[in-house]
Every structure is written in structure tokens, then in C-alpha cells.
Interface confidence: low
């Protein structure tokens, strides 16, 4: 054999006896007829030698160490070569060692080409015998980062201040490349960062530096996990010890991109997070240890990446192919921020593209699935536009405002289904007719159904909210002057059972000038509470609203206002209310900005209540609440 090392290559080759064996016959390195058991070859040297036995691999090992000095000159970054080539070396178990020294401020990154690395613990060996031992440096102290085999998930290891990489190859292994490259990075401000990449299901067992010995005092080590979004990662601690801390607390921190509560801090004894979708980082932070009795901090943990269970294996078909101008969004429902870890909750299109929000549009059939531990964390919001562009074609046309059954069958709660109803300006108006009469939600008589309809103007410049209405009241229909949005909002999961109660028909009708007209047909059994639109913010300036209140022949209606004065102060114009008997056309007019509101009044026949606003001064808005109660006419009202 001949080994020649180029001058200034900073390579040293050492051939020495390996682990003692029970082989009877010894073996020697023979140089110029001298028999020796160790041979050191330095840069610039050329040595010819032989072995005294047929199978030197049973006796000797070879170490090839290259020192790379990044302190005094430029660092040779890039793919690391096996030098000398393995074909020029004797067939011994060989260990290539690269010792890189760098400034504290320089980050060094080892990049492993496929196959990536798999960390092994004490007493474990690699199936193919190829091992990678990696260590770092803190000042003069060597820190063992770990020992790794092939066929794992570790793709990059970042360190600073220097790195020692040892690649052990069995004598029979044909490998002739190092399988890694070195790159420079900015300071990582910690002991090391290990990147672990999962391309599919699998698991990785990882350990703190120096494991099973103690993690260096007050150090920080980070693992970065790259996980496809459609898979879930769970962390479990297989073995850990805590040291005796004098200052600070030993902990692990999770950083999950997109999380609003980063970093998530856990004690080592806590149950670690599971069901994380996508990438995440885990950091181990040591503490200042008690000098007298330091103890040791060590951690061995497993990351398991797998396909999620149960709901996620179901595919839901959302058929919007027959819909027009509709979009369905599945998104996280807002939650109070907490420092507690919350696993990812994703919705996937075609089981592949997973994200926390998903919007489906009309015209297609969509297949979706969920990656979520708790589907109550998600809700659905749907928007549909029904517009009329040609008033001649639309007039008297009706549309049913119903939530499609495909949507109701999804395992996610429907939050809002909004219909945007658009009409040609000054040409047509709209009428909403519910399948079941509606009740207006008021503080005095709140809705207690699982859903309500929120009716508001859909004209951008107009801030007009007609109110919230639920089934089981006395409002027979609502007429509105122009564009509105009707939102079916659910308040309880029981909406699924009550879905049959929903049903609203919208028709395009001839244009009228009032902002809204409510047709009310009270029942004898209950008191009907009605309030002006934009409650709490006040009826918009110069807006007029009417209530058409039906009184059956054998009943008397009692109209009651709930305050003495309207409270409105007009800047310009007048605010007034007209109460008009429909049969006789007799009317009473009240100046709302001056008069006291009428005392309870009795109406034997159907009547109108019309309220028209002025331009009020800010803070002095027009808000009125009134009730209508029916009593039989036979009662002596005197």
C-alpha cells in the first residue's frame, strides 16, 4: 500500500490496532521490513507499507483526520471530499474526521444529502455499520452532539465556534463520498440547531447534547422539524433528568409558525404536544446549576409523524357545481388567546393542500377532509350573492334562502350563511317572507333559538342594521328599499336539528321609498317587542321605517313605548312618528325631538307606526323600543 498526503493538506492518517479480538495470530504494519502496530502519516509524507496478515481488517483501523482552520483564513465551504480517496486506502474499518475551528461569531452548517441521518442512543449500532459522530465546542470543552446512522430524518446540523465530524465506514462498505457539505451561517446564538425533515410517516428519536451525560449548563439547543402539512407530529419524552437549578428554569419551548402564542413553554415533566400539523421547532433550555450539587439535565425524545386518525380519513364532498356567486370558507373560530399549547387544526382540499383556512367557490365539486383534533375549533362562513340586473326580468321573482344540505352535512359548525341581495337602484325593492313568523331579538325578549337572521343594508356607505330575527314570533314579512345582506347565524350545534325551521323567501318587488317596512301579525298569546333599526347606534339620519301591525277583528292591540322621551336631538330637520289607523286613516303625529312619547294606546283595527329621523347631533340618537299586546275585545277596557 502507498499513502501520499499532499503538502499543506492538513490531513493526518493514523493506522492503529482496533478493538481487541480473539484471533490467535497477530498482524502488523510492515514498513521497510519493520513490524509496527501504529503508523502515523502527516501532510506532505508518502509512505509505502504492507500488512503481515491476510485479513488486516480484523485487526486494524484507520483514521483520516483533516483539520480545517477557519480562524486564520477563508473556510473551504461546499461539498466535503473523502481524502485520500477510499480506493487508495487499505480495506480497514475507517474513520474520516473533519475538525473545523471557527470564531464564536461564525455559524457552521453541516448539510447531509440523502440518505439523511438517524440519531442512535448509547449501546445502539447502525445496521450498515456507517456511523456519523458529531461534536461541537464550547470554549475548550468538547460537546457531543450525537451519533447518527443513515436512513433517518436529520438533514442539517448548525453549530458555531467549531465542529468535529467523524464518519465511520466499515472496511467492506463501498462508500466513496462523505455525504455532507459545510456552509457558513450567521451566528446561531446557541449550542446547535438540528433540522429533521419528514417526507412521509415515520419517527425520529433524538437526544440532548452529551446524552446520556448531562446537557451543558445554561445552554440552548434547538430541533427544527419539517413536516408535510397533511401529516401530524407528536412529541413524547422517552427519558429525561432535571438538574438542580440555582437560577432560571429548565424548559422546552415550541415554536409553531403561524401560532399566535409563540413560543409555547413546557416543563419537561409536562405532557408534550401532539397532533401538530406542519413544521415546528423544539428548544431545550438549560439553567444555572447549583455548584455543590448540579445534577444533570438530559433528554431523549421521540417525534412521531403519522397520518391523523378518525375524521381526517373521511372525505366530504361539497357540491357547489350548481351554485352561482357563492363562496364557503372554513376557518378557525376566534378563541381567547391562551399560553396553553393548542395543536394545529387544518382543513384539506383533496386531502393534500392543508391550511387553517379554506375557501371553496361555486361552480365546482370539492372534496375536503380535516386534520384536526377537535372540529369544534373550526366553523363555516358562507356568502352567496343573488342579484338582479334587469328589473323587468326580476320583478315578482322569488328565491329561497336555504342552506344547502351538502353544507349541513359537513362535520363543522355553520357560523354564518350570508345572502347578499342586490337590486337595481331606484327600480326594485325586496321583500323577505319567512316560512315561520319571526321574532325580533331584544333585551326584553331575546331569541333563544339555535339560529337567527341578521338583516343589514348592503350598501357600503350606509350603516343600517335592521336587526336580528329568529323563528317563532309575529313578523310576517320584512320589506326593504335596497340592497341588503341576510345572514343566517347559528348559535348552537342544535341548529342541525332545527335546520328545518329555517326558510326565508326573497322576492323582488316594485321600488318603494321607505328604508324598511315590517309586517307584524301578533299572536294573542304573547307580547311582541319591536325596536328601531341600528339599536344602540341610532336610526341613520333622514331614515324612515314603518311597522304594519295587524289587529284581528275580535282583538284589541295595546301599543306601549318603553321610555318617556325619544332622546333624539336634531341638528337639522325634524324627527317624527305617525301612528295611523288603517281603516279610518286617522293619524296622530308626534314630534320625537320635542314631544313626550305617547302613553300606552289601544287600537281596535290594524294600524301603522312610522318613524322618520332627522339629522341628529352626535350622541343624541334615535332608538325606540315598543311592544304590541293583543287582548280579546270582550274585556272592558274602561
Amino acid at each position: 500500500f502507498e499513502i501520499a498526503l499532499p503538502r499543506e493538506s492538513n490531513i493526518t492518517v493514523l493506522i492503529k490496532l482496533g478493538t481487541p479480538t480473539l484471533l490467535a495470530k497477530p498482524c502488523y504494519i510492515v514498513i521497510s521490513k519493520r513490524h509496527i502496530t501504529m503508523l502515523s502519516i502527516k501532510s506532505g509524507e508518502r509512505i509505502v507499507f504492507t500488512f503481515s496478515c491476510q485479513s488486516p481488517e480484523n485487526h486494524f483501523v484507520i483514521e483520516i483526520q483533516k483539520n480545517i482552520d477557519c480562524m486564520s483564513g477563508p473556510c473551504p465551504f461546499g461539498e466535503v471530499q473523502l481524502q485520500p480517496s477510499t480506493s487508495l486506502l487499505p480495506t480497514l474499518n475507517r474513520t474520516f474526521i473533519w475538525d473545523v475551528k471557527a470564531h464564536k461569531s461564525i455559524g457552521l452548517e453541516l448539510q447531509f444529502s440523502i440518505p439523511r441521518l438517524r440519531q442512535i442512543g448509547p449501546g445502539e449500532s447502525c445496521p450498515d455499520g456507517v456511523t456519523h459522530s458529531i461534536s461541537g465546542r464550547i470554549d475548550a470543552t468538547v460537546v457531543r452532539i450525537g451519533t447518527f446512522c443513515s436512513n433517518g430524518t436529520v438533514s442539517r446540523i448548525k453549530m458555531q465556534e467549531g465542529v468535529k465530524m467523524a464518519l465511520h465506514l466499515p472496511w467492506f462498505h463501498p462508500r466513496n463520498v462523505s455525504g455532507f457539505s459545510i456552509a457558513n451561517r450567521s451566528s446561531i446564538k446557541r449550542l446547535c440547531i438540528i433540522e429533521s425533515v419528514f417526507e412521509g410517516e415515520g419517527s425520529a428519536t433524538l437526544m440532548s447534547a452529551n446524552y446520556p451525560e448531562g446537557f451543558p449548563e445554561d445552554e440552548l439547543m434547538t430541533w427544527q422539524f419539517v413536516v408535510p402539512a397533511h401529516l401530524r407530529a407528536s412529541v413524547s419524552f422517552l427519558n429525561f433528568n432535571l438538574s438542580n437549578c440555582e437560577r432560571k428554569e429548565e424548559r422546552v419551548e415550541y415554536y409553531i409558525p403561524g401560532s399566535t402564542t409563540n413560543p409555547e413553554v413546557f416543563k419537561l415533566e409536562d405532557k408534550q404536544p401532539g397532533n401538530m400539523a406542519g413544521n415546528f421547532n423544539l428548544s431545550l433550555q438549560g439553567c444555572d446549576q447549583d455548584a455543590q450539587s448540579p445534577g444533570i439535565l438530559r433528554l431523549q425524545f421521540q417525534v412521531l409523524v403519522q397520518h391523523p386518525q378518525n375524521e381526517s380519513n373521511k372525505i366530504y364532498v361539497v357540491d357547489l357545481s350548481n351554485e352561482r356567486a357563492m363562496s364557503l370558507t372554513i376557518e378557525p373560530r376566534p378563541v381567547k388567546q391562551s399560553r396553553k399549547f393548542v395543536p394545529g387544526c387544518f382543513v384539506c382540499l383533496e386531502s393534500r393542500t392543508c391550511s387553517s383556512n379554506l375557501t371553496l367557490t361555486s361552480g365546482s365539486k370539492h372534496k375536503i377532509s380535516f386534520l384536526c383534533d377537535d372540529l369544534t375549533r373550526l366553523w363555516m362562513n358562507v356568502e352567496k350573492t343573488i342579484s338582479c340586473t334587469d328589473h323587468r326580468y326580476c320583478q315578482r321573482k322569488s328565491y329561497s334562502l336555504q342552506v344547502p344540505s351538502d353544507i349541513l352535512h359537513l362535520p363543522v359548525e355553520l357560523h354564518d350563511f350570508s345572502w347578499k341581495l342586490l337590486v337595481p337602484k331606484d327600480r326594485l325593492s325586496l321583500v323577505l317572507v319567512p316560512a315561520q313568523k319571526l321574532q325580533q331579538h331584544t333585551h326584553e325578549k331575546p331569541c333563544n333559538t339555535s339560529f337567527s337572521y341578521l338583516v343589514a343594508s348592503a350598501i357600503p356607505s350606509q350603516d343600517l342594521y335592521f336587526g336580528s330575527f329568529c323563528p317563532g314570533g309575529s313578523i310576517k314579512q320584512i320589506q326593504v328599499k335596497q340592497n341588503i345582506s341576510v345572514t343566517l347565524r347559528t348559535f348552537a350545534p342544535s341548529f342541525q336539528q332545527e335546520a328545518s325551521r329555517q326558510g326565508l323567501t326573497v322576492s323582488f318587488i316594485p321600488y318603494f321609498k321607505e328604508e324598511g317596512v315590517f309586517t307584524v301579525t301578533p299572536d294573542t298569546k304573547s307580547k311582541v317587542y319591536l325596536r328601531t333599526p341600528n339599536w344602540d347606534r341610532g336610526l341613520p339620519s333622514l331614515t324612515s321605517v314603518s311597522w304594519n301591525i295587524s289587529v284581528p277583528r275580535d282583538q284589541v292591540a295595546c301599543l306601549t313605548f318603553f321610555k318617556e322621551r325619544s332622546g333624539v336631538v336634531c341638528q337639522t330637520g325634524r324627527a317624527f312618528m305617525i301612528i295611523q289607523e288603517q281603516r279610518t286613516r286617522a293619524e296622530e303625529i308626534f314630534s320625537l325631538d320635542e314631544d313626550v312619547l305617547p302613553k300606552p294606546s289601544f287600537h281596535h283595527h290594524s294600524f301603522w307606526v312610522n318613524i322618520s329621523n332627522c339629522s341628529p347631533t352626535s350622541g343624541k340618537q334615535l332608538d325606540l323600543l315598543f311592544s304590541v299586546t293583543l287582548t280579546p275585545r270582550t274585556v272592558d277596557l274602561t
Partner: antibody, heavy 116, light 108 residues
Framework: EVQLVESGGGLVQPGGSLRLSCAAS????????MHWVRQAPGKGLEWVAS????????SYADSVKGRFTISADTSKNTAYLQMNSLRAEDTAVYYC?????????WGQGTLVTVSS | DIQMTQSPSSLSASVGDRVTITCRAS??????VAWYQQKPGKAPKLLIY???SLYSGVPSRFSGSRSGTDFTLTISSLQPEDFATYYC??????????FGQGTKVEIK
């Protein structure tokens, strides 16, 4: 509906070459690993090669390393197996399979006969 | 490579019988084991993945279990259409995948 259709099999002399194709429909191969598995007449299943089109990572059984090359054209949604230096022991039905829940979808197979 | 030792190589059973096929991995493969059914002239079909998860569309009479490196496929009540060859396969750490030798389930 997910479907895998293999083609390109046939009779070839020892030392010859063949290129098998696996046309996928109903899913995008970019998101899955694609595998070739073979079955010699009257024998069991033998995994041959795999590719993850999204990473370009390929892997081979020792028995075919250096002779077979797996590739994928994501624009055609097709995986390929280029087989060179064919031997009699390569005679088998070659199946293309999708890797997701293990090998969850398989093609109907294409027969490769290596004989002089 | 990881070896998968499957037993028995063949078995005879009657309709309604409970059938058990086992596979032993030469080293730890976690739960990365799948079971396939193959009928003559047809491609294999996935039955079980992740050692015990039933693949969609597969009848519930098929089940899988794991005990360390031993894996079992059970058919609780054999049906006429279940007569076929069954293969186990490990896919731990992805490559190389290895299959068991197969178990032929024949009519008694």
C-alpha cells in the same frame, strides 16, 4: 377515481432494455411516492424502486441498483422505470403503486419477459 | 435490510372460520406494517396499514394487530371471496420496503 395504468412491458432479450410507464389519474403524483413492485411467475412480491417526485428522492432494491432508473414526469402525471441490462431473473409482472397509506393503489401490472 | 418472516406459507380453512396470519420483523419497524390481499392474475389490494388501521372500503372482518415486532392479520369469519394470498410488508424508514413471503389461504 384513482387509477394507475402500466404499459411498456413485453418480451426482451437478456442484456436488452425496456421502459415501463405508469400513467396516474385521479390524483397528482407530485404529492405521493411512486413505487414499482414486481412479481416473478408463481413467486411473491418484491419491491423494486421508488421515487418521491416532490423531493426527487429515489431508492432501489439492491437487485436492480445500477441497472434500473426510476423517474417521474409530474407534468404528464406519469412515473417511469427504465430497465437496462435485463436478465432472465427480471422476468415478472411489474406493478406500479402509489405510496400513501402504505401502497394504497396499484396498477393492473405489465408483464416483462426476458428470454432469448 | 429488514426481513419479514411470514407464517404459515399456506393454510386451508372453511367459510366462517377465524383465520390468523403472522409476520415477524427482523428488527423494530414500529407500526409501519401493511397487509395486502392478492387474487390470481390481479394486483394486490391494501387491507391494513399502520399495523392495525383498516383501509377504506375493506370489510370489518379484517383486522390487524401488533405486539413488538410480531404482526397479525385476522379474518374473523372467512368469506368465499377471501380465498387469496396475503402479504405483509414493512415500510419503516421508507426504504427498502420488504414483503413477507406470502400466505395462501385455500378452501379446505
Amino acid at each position: 377515481e384513482v387509477q394507475l395504468v402500466e404499459s411498456g412491458g413485453g418480451l426482451v432479450q437478456p442484456g436488452g432494455s425496456l421502459r415501463l410507464s405508469c400513467a396516474a389519474s385521479g390524483f397528482n403524483i407530485s404529492y405521493y411516492s411512486m413505487h414499482w413492485v414486481r412479481q416473478a411467475p408463481g413467486k411473491g412480491l418484491e419491491w423494486v424502486a421508488s421515487i418521491s417526485p416532490y423531493s426527487g428522492y429515489t431508492s432501489y432494491a439492491d437487485s436492480v441498483k445500477g441497472r434500473f432508473t426510476i423517474s417521474a414526469d409530474t407534468s404528464k402525471n406519469t412515473a417511469y422505470l427504465q430497465m437496462n441490462s435485463l436478465r432472465a431473473e427480471d422476468t415478472a409482472v411489474y406493478y406500479c403503486a402509489r405510496g400513501y397509506y402504505a401502497l394504497d393503489y396499484w396498477g393492473q401490472g405489465t408483464l416483462v419477459t426476458v428470454s432469448s | 435490510d429488514i426481513q419479514m418472516t411470514q407464517s404459515p406459507s399456506s393454510l386451508s380453512a372453511s367459510v366462517g372460520d377465524r383465520v390468523t396470519i403472522t409476520c415477524r420483523a427482523s428488527q423494530s419497524v414500529s407500526s409501519a406494517v401493511a397487509w395486502y390481499q392478492q387474487k390470481p392474475g390481479k394486483a394486490p389490494k391494501l387491507l391494513i396499514y399502520s399495523a392495525s388501521s383498516l383501509y377504506s372500503g375493506v370489510p370489518s372482518r379484517f383486522s390487524g394487530s401488533r405486539s413488538g415486532t410480531d404482526f397479525t392479520l385476522t379474518i374473523s369469519s372467512l368469506q368465499p371471496e377471501d380465498f387469496a394470498t396475503y402479504y405483509c410488508q414493512q415500510y419503516y424508514y421508507f426504504y427498502p420496503f420488504t414483503f413477507g413471503q406470502g400466505t395462501k389461504v385455500e378452501i379446505k
